[in-house]
Amino acid sequence: ASHSGMINPSRQWQTLKQNTGVAHFEYQIRVTCDDYYYGFGCNKFCRPRDDFFGHYACDQNGNKTCMEGWMGPECNRAICRQGCSPKHGSCKLPGDCRCQYGWQGLYCD
Protein backbone atom coordinates (compact mmCIF):
# COMPACT_ATOMS: atom_id res chain seq x y z
CA ALA A 1 0.00 0.00 0.00
CA SER A 2 1.22 3.49 -0.71
CA HIS A 3 0.02 6.97 0.11
CA SER A 4 0.73 10.14 -1.78
CA GLY A 5 -0.04 13.57 -0.40
CA MET A 6 1.15 16.16 2.05
CA ILE A 7 1.46 15.15 5.67
CA ASN A 8 2.31 18.11 7.87
CA PRO A 9 4.61 17.67 10.86
CA SER A 10 2.55 17.14 14.00
CA ARG A 11 2.66 15.40 17.35
CA GLN A 12 -0.73 13.92 16.57
CA TRP A 13 -1.12 10.63 14.79
CA GLN A 14 -3.21 10.73 11.59
CA THR A 15 -5.33 7.78 10.53
CA LEU A 16 -5.16 6.91 6.85
CA LYS A 17 -7.66 4.56 5.27
CA GLN A 18 -7.14 2.83 1.97
CA ASN A 19 -9.35 0.41 0.12
CA THR A 20 -7.64 -1.37 -2.74
CA GLY A 21 -10.62 -3.55 -3.56
CA VAL A 22 -8.63 -6.59 -2.53
CA ALA A 23 -7.87 -5.42 0.98
CA HIS A 24 -8.76 -2.63 3.34
CA PHE A 25 -5.82 -0.87 4.99
CA GLU A 26 -6.02 1.41 7.96
CA TYR A 27 -2.82 2.79 9.39
CA GLN A 28 -1.61 5.61 11.56
CA ILE A 29 1.16 7.94 10.57
CA ARG A 30 2.87 11.04 11.83
CA VAL A 31 5.76 13.17 10.69
CA THR A 32 7.90 14.94 13.25
CA CYS A 33 10.70 17.42 12.69
CA ASP A 34 14.22 16.76 13.95
CA ASP A 35 15.11 18.40 17.26
CA TYR A 36 15.13 22.21 17.05
CA TYR A 37 13.44 22.29 13.62
CA TYR A 38 9.92 23.63 13.18
CA GLY A 39 7.35 24.49 10.53
CA PHE A 40 5.60 22.62 7.72
CA GLY A 41 8.87 22.04 5.91
CA CYS A 42 10.89 21.50 9.10
CA ASN A 43 13.11 24.31 7.87
CA LYS A 44 12.81 26.75 10.77
CA PHE A 45 15.62 26.32 13.29
CA CYS A 46 15.42 27.37 16.93
CA ARG A 47 17.64 26.07 19.72
CA PRO A 48 17.49 27.92 23.05
CA ARG A 49 20.63 29.64 24.23
CA ASP A 50 21.95 31.84 27.00
CA ASP A 51 25.28 33.17 25.82
CA PHE A 52 27.01 35.91 23.82
CA PHE A 53 24.81 35.23 20.79
CA GLY A 54 21.42 35.35 22.49
CA HIS A 55 19.23 34.80 25.52
CA TYR A 56 16.07 32.99 24.47
CA ALA A 57 13.80 29.97 24.59
CA CYS A 58 11.68 28.71 21.69
CA ASP A 59 7.90 28.50 21.55
CA GLN A 60 5.95 25.60 20.00
CA ASN A 61 6.18 27.25 16.58
CA GLY A 62 9.94 27.73 16.74
CA ASN A 63 9.81 31.45 17.46
CA LYS A 64 12.48 32.87 19.72
CA THR A 65 11.09 34.17 23.00
CA CYS A 66 13.56 36.51 24.63
CA MET A 67 14.42 36.19 28.29
CA GLU A 68 13.28 39.20 30.26
CA GLY A 69 15.62 42.14 29.75
CA TRP A 70 16.69 41.20 26.24
CA MET A 71 15.40 42.23 22.83
CA GLY A 72 16.09 42.03 19.11
CA PRO A 73 15.70 39.20 16.60
CA GLU A 74 18.44 37.23 18.36
CA CYS A 75 17.61 38.48 21.88
CA ASN A 76 21.17 39.75 22.30
CA ARG A 77 20.45 43.43 22.88
CA ALA A 78 20.04 44.34 26.53
CA ILE A 79 17.08 46.48 27.55
CA CYS A 80 18.56 49.36 29.48
CA ARG A 81 17.24 50.96 32.66
CA GLN A 82 13.89 52.61 32.07
CA GLY A 83 14.56 56.25 31.27
CA CYS A 84 18.16 55.66 30.15
CA SER A 85 18.98 58.23 27.48
CA PRO A 86 18.94 56.51 24.08
CA LYS A 87 21.36 59.16 22.86
CA HIS A 88 23.91 59.28 25.66
CA GLY A 89 23.43 56.00 27.52
CA SER A 90 23.77 52.33 26.65
CA CYS A 91 24.00 48.96 28.37
CA LYS A 92 25.39 45.47 28.02
CA LEU A 93 23.35 44.09 30.91
CA PRO A 94 19.58 44.44 31.38
CA GLY A 95 18.62 47.34 33.62
CA ASP A 96 21.97 49.06 33.37
CA CYS A 97 22.70 52.54 31.95
CA ARG A 98 26.28 53.45 31.02
CA CYS A 99 27.00 57.03 30.05
CA GLN A 100 29.00 58.29 27.11
CA TYR A 101 32.05 60.36 27.98
CA GLY A 102 30.92 63.79 29.20
CA TRP A 103 27.49 62.64 30.36
CA GLN A 104 26.43 61.51 33.81
CA GLY A 105 23.46 60.82 36.05
CA LEU A 106 21.26 57.80 36.60
CA TYR A 107 19.86 58.16 33.07
CA CYS A 108 22.90 59.75 31.37
CA ASP A 109 20.80 62.83 30.61
Epitope: P48, D50, D51, F52, F53, C58, M67, E68, G69, L93
Partner: antibody
Framework: EVQLVESGGGLVQPGGSLRLSCAAS????????IHWVRQAPGKGLEWVGW????????DYADSVKGRFTISADTSKNTAYLQMNSLRAEDTAVYYC?????????WGQGTLVTVSS | DIQMTQSPSSLSASVGDRVTITCRAS??????VAWYQQKPGKAPKLLIY???FLYSGVPSRFSGSGSGTDFTLTISSLQPEDFATYYC?????????FGQGTKVEIK
Protein backbone atom coordinates in the same frame (compact mmCIF):
# COMPACT_ATOMS: atom_id res chain seq x y z
CA GLU B 1 14.67 40.99 45.49
CA VAL B 2 15.92 38.02 43.47
CA GLN B 3 16.40 34.93 45.63
CA LEU B 4 17.42 31.37 44.85
CA VAL B 5 17.35 28.65 47.51
CA GLU B 6 18.71 25.16 46.92
CA SER B 7 17.71 22.13 48.98
CA GLY B 8 17.83 18.35 48.84
CA GLY B 9 21.54 17.71 49.33
CA GLY B 10 22.88 14.98 51.57
CA LEU B 11 24.84 11.75 51.78
CA VAL B 12 24.14 9.11 49.15
CA GLN B 13 25.85 5.84 48.20
CA PRO B 14 27.57 5.36 44.84
CA GLY B 15 24.99 4.34 42.25
CA GLY B 16 22.25 6.06 44.22
CA SER B 17 19.95 8.93 43.32
CA LEU B 18 19.14 12.36 44.71
CA ARG B 19 16.89 15.22 43.66
CA LEU B 20 17.90 18.82 44.32
CA SER B 21 15.48 21.74 44.25
CA CYS B 22 16.05 25.39 43.44
CA ALA B 23 13.20 27.61 44.63
CA ALA B 24 13.17 31.00 42.92
CA SER B 25 11.51 34.22 44.00
CA UNK B 26 11.63 37.92 43.16
CA UNK B 27 11.34 37.42 39.41
CA UNK B 28 9.08 35.76 36.85
CA UNK B 29 10.62 32.29 36.62
CA UNK B 30 9.16 31.47 33.20
CA UNK B 31 10.84 34.54 31.65
CA UNK B 32 14.34 33.37 32.49
CA UNK B 33 15.82 29.94 33.13
CA ILE B 34 18.10 28.24 35.62
CA HIS B 35 21.68 26.99 35.42
CA TRP B 36 23.23 24.46 37.78
CA VAL B 37 26.91 24.83 38.68
CA ARG B 38 28.87 22.60 41.05
CA GLN B 39 32.08 22.84 43.03
CA ALA B 40 33.93 19.80 44.33
CA PRO B 41 35.63 20.29 47.74
CA GLY B 42 38.69 22.50 47.31
CA LYS B 43 38.19 22.65 43.53
CA GLY B 44 36.92 25.12 40.94
CA LEU B 45 33.51 25.78 39.43
CA GLU B 46 31.96 23.42 36.87
CA TRP B 47 28.81 24.05 34.86
CA VAL B 48 26.34 21.14 35.10
CA GLY B 49 23.48 22.18 32.85
CA TRP B 50 20.55 24.52 32.38
CA UNK B 51 16.83 24.67 31.61
CA UNK B 52 14.75 27.35 29.94
CA UNK B 53 12.12 29.15 31.96
CA UNK B 54 9.29 27.43 30.10
CA UNK B 55 10.82 24.04 30.91
CA UNK B 56 10.89 23.08 27.25
CA UNK B 57 14.62 22.66 26.81
CA UNK B 58 17.58 21.52 28.86
CA ASP B 59 21.24 20.95 28.10
CA TYR B 60 24.01 19.24 30.06
CA ALA B 61 27.75 19.00 30.55
CA ASP B 62 29.24 15.86 29.01
CA SER B 63 30.27 14.66 32.48
CA VAL B 64 26.63 14.30 33.62
CA LYS B 65 24.79 13.65 30.34
CA GLY B 66 22.52 10.62 30.58
CA ARG B 67 22.69 10.57 34.38
CA PHE B 68 21.34 13.98 35.40
CA THR B 69 18.03 15.53 34.36
CA ILE B 70 16.93 19.13 34.90
CA SER B 71 13.23 19.92 35.04
CA ALA B 72 11.09 22.85 36.12
CA ASP B 73 7.70 23.42 37.68
CA THR B 74 6.75 26.95 36.66
CA SER B 75 3.69 26.92 38.92
CA LYS B 76 6.03 26.45 41.89
CA ASN B 77 8.83 28.68 40.53
CA THR B 78 11.18 25.77 41.12
CA ALA B 79 13.84 23.98 39.10
CA TYR B 80 14.99 20.46 39.90
CA LEU B 81 18.19 18.52 39.34
CA GLN B 82 17.55 14.77 39.32
CA MET B 83 20.84 12.94 39.80
CA ASN B 84 21.03 9.21 39.08
CA SER B 85 23.91 6.71 39.00
CA LEU B 86 25.89 8.97 41.32
CA ARG B 87 29.66 8.61 41.52
CA ALA B 88 32.25 9.70 44.09
CA GLU B 89 33.36 12.43 41.66
CA ASP B 90 29.88 13.99 41.81
CA THR B 91 30.58 15.01 45.42
CA ALA B 92 30.28 18.80 45.41
CA VAL B 93 28.35 21.84 46.51
CA TYR B 94 25.61 22.37 43.91
CA TYR B 95 24.51 25.91 43.12
CA CYS B 96 21.67 27.16 40.98
CA UNK B 97 22.00 30.50 39.19
CA UNK B 98 19.52 32.55 37.21
CA UNK B 99 19.91 32.60 33.44
CA UNK B 100 19.80 35.72 31.32
CA UNK B 101 22.43 37.94 32.94
CA UNK B 102 25.74 36.13 33.31
CA UNK B 103 25.64 34.45 36.72
CA UNK B 104 24.66 37.53 38.66
CA UNK B 105 22.30 35.68 41.00
CA TRP B 106 23.26 32.49 42.84
CA GLY B 107 21.74 30.35 45.54
CA GLN B 108 23.64 29.53 48.72
CA GLY B 109 24.43 26.00 47.54
CA THR B 110 23.63 22.51 48.83
CA LEU B 111 26.24 19.84 49.57
CA VAL B 112 25.99 16.42 47.93
CA THR B 113 28.31 13.72 49.27
CA VAL B 114 28.62 10.43 47.38
CA SER B 115 30.30 7.86 49.59
CA SER B 116 29.86 4.32 50.84
CA ASP C 1 34.64 23.17 24.79
CA ILE C 2 36.48 26.42 25.37
CA GLN C 3 39.25 26.16 27.99
CA MET C 4 39.93 29.09 30.31
CA THR C 5 43.43 29.13 31.81
CA GLN C 6 44.06 31.42 34.75
CA SER C 7 47.37 32.55 36.16
CA PRO C 8 48.74 32.57 38.71
CA SER C 9 46.91 29.82 40.60
CA SER C 10 47.72 31.65 43.84
CA LEU C 11 49.47 34.80 44.94
CA SER C 12 50.44 36.53 48.17
CA ALA C 13 49.97 40.26 48.47
CA SER C 14 49.70 43.01 51.06
CA VAL C 15 46.92 45.49 51.72
CA GLY C 16 47.36 48.40 49.32
CA ASP C 17 49.09 46.32 46.63
CA ARG C 18 48.05 46.38 43.00
CA VAL C 19 47.07 42.86 41.96
CA THR C 20 46.69 41.51 38.42
CA ILE C 21 45.17 38.17 37.46
CA THR C 22 45.15 36.95 33.87
CA CYS C 23 42.92 34.55 31.99
CA ARG C 24 43.51 33.06 28.56
CA ALA C 25 40.79 31.46 26.43
CA SER C 26 41.61 28.54 24.11
CA UNK C 27 39.80 30.36 21.30
CA UNK C 28 38.44 33.81 20.53
CA UNK C 29 35.58 34.66 22.92
CA UNK C 30 35.21 38.33 21.91
CA UNK C 31 34.43 40.16 25.18
CA UNK C 32 32.22 37.42 26.62
CA VAL C 33 34.16 37.06 29.86
CA ALA C 34 33.12 37.61 33.46
CA TRP C 35 35.06 37.63 36.72
CA TYR C 36 33.77 36.30 40.06
CA GLN C 37 34.97 36.54 43.64
CA GLN C 38 34.37 33.65 46.02
CA LYS C 39 34.99 33.42 49.74
CA PRO C 40 35.06 30.09 51.66
CA GLY C 41 31.61 28.59 52.18
CA LYS C 42 29.91 31.24 50.04
CA ALA C 43 28.54 31.40 46.51
CA PRO C 44 30.58 33.28 43.90
CA LYS C 45 29.81 36.98 43.34
CA LEU C 46 29.86 38.65 39.95
CA LEU C 47 32.46 41.44 39.75
CA ILE C 48 33.00 42.16 36.05
CA TYR C 49 30.95 41.21 32.99
CA UNK C 50 31.53 41.64 29.25
CA UNK C 51 35.28 41.75 30.00
CA UNK C 52 35.37 45.32 31.35
CA PHE C 53 32.00 46.33 32.83
CA LEU C 54 31.86 46.72 36.60
CA TYR C 55 28.80 45.01 38.07
CA SER C 56 26.43 47.07 40.19
CA GLY C 57 27.66 47.59 43.76
CA VAL C 58 31.21 46.39 43.09
CA PRO C 59 33.95 48.79 44.30
CA SER C 60 35.72 50.76 41.58
CA ARG C 61 39.12 49.37 42.62
CA PHE C 62 38.17 46.32 40.56
CA SER C 63 38.59 46.59 36.79
CA GLY C 64 38.69 44.25 33.85
CA SER C 65 40.17 44.45 30.38
CA GLY C 66 40.83 42.37 27.30
CA SER C 67 39.15 40.86 24.27
CA GLY C 68 39.67 37.87 22.03
CA THR C 69 41.71 35.41 24.06
CA ASP C 70 43.53 37.44 26.74
CA PHE C 71 41.80 39.00 29.74
CA THR C 72 42.90 40.71 32.94
CA LEU C 73 41.33 41.42 36.32
CA THR C 74 43.05 44.20 38.26
CA ILE C 75 42.57 45.23 41.88
CA SER C 76 44.15 48.68 42.10
CA SER C 77 44.62 48.76 45.87
CA LEU C 78 44.01 45.51 47.69
CA GLN C 79 41.73 45.72 50.73
CA PRO C 80 41.42 43.22 53.61
CA GLU C 81 38.03 42.05 52.31
CA ASP C 82 39.51 41.23 48.88
CA PHE C 83 41.39 38.16 50.09
CA ALA C 84 39.44 35.44 48.28
CA THR C 85 39.50 33.20 45.21
CA TYR C 86 38.81 34.75 41.79
CA TYR C 87 37.44 32.96 38.73
CA CYS C 88 37.11 33.98 35.11
CA UNK C 89 34.29 32.54 33.01
CA UNK C 90 33.45 32.62 29.32
CA UNK C 91 29.87 32.95 28.17
CA UNK C 92 30.62 32.98 24.46
CA UNK C 93 29.14 29.55 23.81
CA UNK C 94 27.62 26.64 25.71
CA UNK C 95 28.96 25.06 27.81
CA UNK C 96 30.05 28.07 29.85
CA UNK C 97 33.48 27.32 31.28
CA PHE C 98 35.47 28.68 34.21
CA GLY C 99 39.14 29.19 34.89
CA GLN C 100 40.64 27.05 37.64
CA GLY C 101 40.74 29.99 40.05
CA THR C 102 43.33 32.29 41.60
CA LYS C 103 43.63 32.38 45.38
CA VAL C 104 44.70 35.78 46.71
CA GLU C 105 46.31 35.36 50.14
CA ILE C 106 47.74 37.74 52.72
CA LYS C 107 51.52 38.14 52.59
Amino acid sequence: EVQLVESGGGLVQPGGSLRLSCAASGFTFSNYGIHWVRQAPGKGLEWVGWITGNGGYSDYADSVKGRFTISADTSKNTAYLQMNSLRAEDTAVYYCARAGSWFAYWGQGTLVTVSS
Amino acid sequence: DIQMTQSPSSLSASVGDRVTITCRASQDVSTAVAWYQQKPGKAPKLLIYSASFLYSGVPSRFSGSGSGTDFTLTISSLQPEDFATYYCQQSYTTPPTFGQGTKVEIK
